[in-house]
Amino acid sequence: KKEDGESTAPTPRPKILRCKCHHHCPEDSVNNICSTDGYCFTMIEEDDSGMPVVTSGCLGLEGSDFQCRDTPIPHQRRSIECCTERNECNKDLHPTLPPLKNRDFVDGPIHHK
């Protein structure tokens, strides 16, 4: 998902950006704050047992446009949101898991309310 301050071709920021990191803190982070030349992100995905896991941190400029594009991966429920508009902007990102597709289930049809 695209957020404020982004464009399709990422341009280098003139200054470093600080992001909250959780489950994804690099060695050079301090007090769960990482720094980057790219984007802050928050991601939600299912672990092996089907439980939702939220991860947040920094994405370097290199390759981050592709990573922030959130292209669907078959058989993987995952959603990522990226931002650059202010330091720790990813504190306010709340991606949600995409809905389950019927074919992901083997135990009968789903009934929506």
Partner: antibody, heavy 116, light 112 residues
Framework: QVQLQQPGADLVKPGTSVKLSCKAS????????MQWVKQRPGQGLEWIGE????????MYNQKFKGKATLTVDTSSSTAYMQLSSLTSEDSAVYYC?????????WGQGTTLTVSS | DVVMTQTPLSLPVSLGDQASISCRSS???????????LHWYLQKAGQSPKLLIY???NRFSGVPDRFSGSGSGTDFTLKISRVEAEDLGVYFC?????????FGSGTKLEIK
């Protein structure tokens, strides 16, 4: 051209506070962090902390937490550092410096003397 | 904190000589983005520091090409190919990979 203007000197009494200023010109103030660095004779350079004028987000050297408070006034493109409970150990030259991914421009420094 | 160790502390040279200053860090300065934030500054007597080299080997605008920087990881070098009188002063290395950012103790370049 980029300029960071700081007062040349300040003399203050022990136990008081002081607010040092740094007026930026020649660039968009909110596009860069502002750092503050302390230099005492024979003690090298010490990073105090930095502030992002675009959102007033601050990062401090743990050593200076409680001693230094960084603020900005974006309307006048001025950064400030308040130093509290001053002692002779705070006597030094204090520099402001523009920071993106590295410091590229420094102010001329303010010489702070703490003396009764 | 990352300790930056500069050698030598004092470097007496003759004008026209080559000068070499070493800077070692207590941890790798390779940032998680892949950049190495190691920089060199010159401080002349009574002045504020001036940027010479940023990110290991990039000369800042207006810096003569007799200044060059090299190195990687924890080991870095500043070279001045032919020392001129205006080069005299104290040289500092600095890292902005790890918070708190830290500086070397300085190398004083002086006339022999």
């Amino acid at each position: 051209q980029v300029q960071l203007q700081q007062p040349g000197a300040d003399l203050v009494k022990p136990g008081t506070s002081v607010k040092l200023s740094c007026k930026a010109s020649g660039y968009t103030f909110t596009s860069y962090w502002m750092q503050w660095v302390k230099q005492r004779p024979g003690q090298g350079l010490e990073w105090i902390g930095e502030i992002d004028p675009s959102d007033t987000y601050t990062m401090y050297n743990q050593k200076f937490k409680g001693k230094a408070t960084l603020t900005v006034d974006t309307s006048s493109s001025t950064a400030y550092m308040q130093l509290s409970s001053l002692t002779s150990e705070d006597s030094a030259v204090y520099y402001c410096a523009r920071f993106g991914y590295y410091v590229d421009y420094w102010g001329q420094g303010t010489t702070l003397t703490v003396s009764s | 904190d990352v300790v930056m160790t500069q050698t030598p502390l004092s470097l007496p040279v003759s004008l026209g000589d080559q000068a070499s200053i070493s800077c070692r860090s207590s941890q790798s300065l390779v940032h998680s983005t892949g950049n190495t934030y190691l920089h060199w500054y010159l401080q002349k007597a009574g002045q504020s520091p001036k940027l010479l080299i940023y990110k290991v080997s990039n000369r800042f605008s207006g810096v003569p090409d007799r200044f060059s920087g090299s190195g990687s990881g924890t080991d870095f070098t500043l070279k001045i190919s032919r020392v001129e009188a205006e080069d005299l002063g104290v040289y500092f290395c600095s890292q902005s990979t790890h918070v708190p950012f830290t500086f070397g103790s300085g190398t004083k370049l002086e006339i022999k």
